[in-house]
Amino acid sequence: DSSKWVFEHPETLYAWEGACVWIPCTYRALDGDLESFILFHNPEYNKNTSKFDGTRLYESTKDGKVPSEQKRVQFLGDKNKNCTLSIHPVHLNDSGQLGLRMESKTEKWMERIHLNVSERPFPPHIQLPPEIQESQEVTLTCLLNFSCYGYPIQLQWLLEGVPMRQAAVTSTSLTIKSVFTRSELKFSPQWSHHGKIVTCQLQDADGKFLSNDTVQLNVKHTPKLEIKVTPSDAIVREGDSVTMTCEVSSSNPEYTTVSWLKDGTSLKKQNTFTLNLREVTKDQSGKYCCQVSNDVGPGRSEEVFLQVQYAPEPSTVQILHSPAVEGSQVEFLCMSLANPLPTNYTWYHNGKEMQGRTEEKVHIPKILPWHAGTYSCVAENILGTGQRGPGAELDVQYPPKKVTTVIQNPMPIREGDTVTLSCNYNSSNPSVTRYEWKPHGAWEEPSLGVLKIQNVGWDNTTIACAACNSWCSWASPVALNVQYAPRDVRVRKIKPLSEIHSGNSVSLQCDFSSSHPKEVQFFWEKNGRLLGKESQLNFDSISPEDAGSYSCWVNNSIGQTASKAWTLEVLYAPRRLRVSMSPGDQVMEGKSATLTCESDANPPVSHYTWFDWNNQSLPYHSQKLRLEPVKVQHSGAYWCQGTNSVGKGRSPLSTLTVYYSPETIGRR
């Protein structure tokens, strides 16, 4: 049943004498495995024998025996899927029909494959895109309907017989659908490639020539132009004539229109290959080119720079920068249209020629106020001298100059006076708009440049003003020389260096920080009583009674100033000690008796010690000694001792009498 056999393979295979052929092939025998395979050359069916006649190129039987002469032809298939064949080498007389006779247990089939073997290697085929345009990348394809594993080949590209630099990509196909070798070359043709011959050359593995295919490139491109000018350097003077000619060196397809452009703009009514310019003017200077178009697009020639020479035009001056700040640098630029460029310049400041200035630029590194004014220039070239233009104004700005602070008051100034000062200056550009004063204070400015200080302070030593436009210029400070009463008067202990103990020699100093005028007098007082008129107050042997509040006064011709009251503290050991008794020096037994150690001491007593009539120390440390309950045996004389950081003091004896209670008397 023929429907059970399905084959896939190329319909025709191509090769040449001495090469090889590889036949990719698949099949499906649905009733079982292949049992017998015969490869016929040009098989013919014999009706008498019901068998095929023809040359048997390959035969494989059930026992697997293969005749020894069949080494050239190989069956590379299997019993159920693969029917691939190889003939190596292949001969011219192998051309024709190959018949694959397949037999399974119950079925038979003859499959036919065409084989075309040429005497010599057949040429590959070059495929080009329908249109090639300059600078547009195209792919050139070279195709050969041959590929065989046992016979390697290569395809090489040549341009005008020279190998092409571009890398080609070669691919092969050996499948049941197709057998071929293909080379693809990506290439960006230029207009110069038009008409050139491209070759695809088939070579064997050693690079030996086998065959080739050639094509002529048809590269579409815009017109390629050359421009010629008379005179050749394109330099003329006003009134001369100029001729420009446009020549087409290549165009594919043919050109259709011609035009001329100046500085990129089309010239009207100029549509021939020659451009005639008569009696040129300087305005006709510029860049000229011709433009020729075809179906691909317009082509342009190189530009010709036409220079029409003329004498300098009236000049203008550009200043970098005005207004200029004094001390900065300024550059003047003389601008004058001329061809050729001016070779010499003459500069003028306020109409007067500036000696030694012949350049296009004048640079002044450090501008001074006298540099202000009008600057003009004249330019000169080989064709003549230009006219002097209107010129440019340089404004030189500078801070106010010679600023001074002036005191308007009569001298001397006393603390508390109202002082008026003015701020004067010599010149300024721009005008002075404001004033500043140092130091800052809550002061009045009744008018511009005038300062009024109400109630002037003793410490207002100097005042400086600044006159300001865009900048401030400060005057030298002016001394107010304010007179005032002595300041910061205070009492200072000179000796002893440490605390004052009773009996010490003591010196107190009356200090003050400043006085203007400097001549002063001193006064010492305690509790409103005058003690002395020297800067020092001395005690040969201080006593606690000297303690108290002391003040000193310092006066000058302006006034007098008192110190803060200064407390003189005298340290002394406890004195005037006595023992007081509460509720009294006679107490009934069983009650409470409190003994208090009273004293006068500076610093206060820090430690008390109590003693009885036998000078026995009692274990109490407080100012008060409490006996509770008091006993008759506690009757006797007690005394205390007080201690501070200076020393010790002791009290006289105080007698405590403890009498019997009525209960005790009753019991007796």
Partner: antibody
Framework: EVQLQQSGPGLVKPSLTLSLTCAIS??????????WTWIRQSPSRGLEWLGR?????????DYAVSVKSRITINPDTSKNQFSLQLNSVTPEDTAVYYC???????????WGQGTLVTV | QSALTQPASVSGSPGQSITISCTGT?????????VSWYQQHPGKAPKLMIY???NRPSGVSNRFSGSKSGNTASLTISGLQAEDEADYYC???????????FGTGTKVTVL
């Protein structure tokens, strides 16, 4: 070396009197440079100074304000000891009672072994 | 008379230093230089460690030191050792009728 040996009952009924004795060795109760003190310690009140007795030209006593109305501290020169009596006791008086010696300074260098008294 | 205020507990690792504070008033700690410190191990009587603010009785390690500033006294134990773990009490003479006042006590733990 001064040593203090305490004696007295460990259990006292409420409202009765707590009595403890502290026997002195290595010093005299009549020393005119020492004082003899009772201190107690309980979890609720910590260490608490109760009072002291001492001899200078005569005998003196000082008592803490908290127990002044109930306390008596007496020296016994014949036995070289001193005693504590605390009247009208309550469970609040439950504590460890210590006798201690104060020397010439205000500190306690010598202590008895302590007696736990439970009311 | 209120007890002097001490921290309830202070702890330190062996070799470290710790300080215990004792705060009173001008009537006790601040008014007199009669501050003493006592160490008490469980079940034992207190032991004098420092007297008159900063003096050490013979037999007490020089790792123990005392000081006073204003109404606050301090005990410092340097080079802490395991045997230093105990309760510590301060005490001061006072101008009230109750002549002596003790601190609330501080438990020292050696970690």
């Amino acid at each position: 070396e001064v040593q203090l040996q305490q004696s007295g009952p460990g259990l006292v009924k409420p409202s009765l009197t707590l009595s403890l004795t502290c026997a002195i060795s290595g010093d005299s109760v009549s020393s005119n440079s020492a004082t003899w003190t009772w201190i107690r310690q309980s979890p609720s009140r910590g260490l608490e100074w109760l009072g002291r007795t001492y001899y200078r030209s005569t005998w003196y006593n000082d008592y803490a304000v908290s127990v002044k109305s109930r306390i008596t501290i007496n020296p016994d020169t014949s036995k070289n000891q001193f005693s504590l009596q605390l009247n009208s006791v309550t469970p609040e008086d439950t504590a460890v009672y210590y006798c201690a010696r104060e020397g010439s300074g205000s500190y306690y260098a010598y202590w008895g072994q302590g007696t736990l008294v439970t009311v | 008379q209120s007890a002097l205020t001490q921290p309830a507990s202070v702890s330190g690792s062996p070799g470290q230093s710790i300080t215990i504070s004792c705060t009173g008033t001008s009537s006790d700690v601040g008014g007199y230089n009669y501050v003493s410190w006592y160490q008490q191990h469980p079940g034992k009587a207190p032991k004098l460690m420092i007297y008159d603010v900063s003096n050490r009785p013979s037999g007490v390690s020089n790792r123990f030191s005392g000081s006073k500033s204003g109404n606050t006294a301090s005990l410092t134990i340097s080079g802490l050792q395991a045997e230093d773990e105990a309760d510590y009490y301060c005490s001061s003479y006072t101008s009230s009728s109750t002549l002596y006042v003790f601190g609330t006590g501080t438990k020292v733990t050696v970690l």
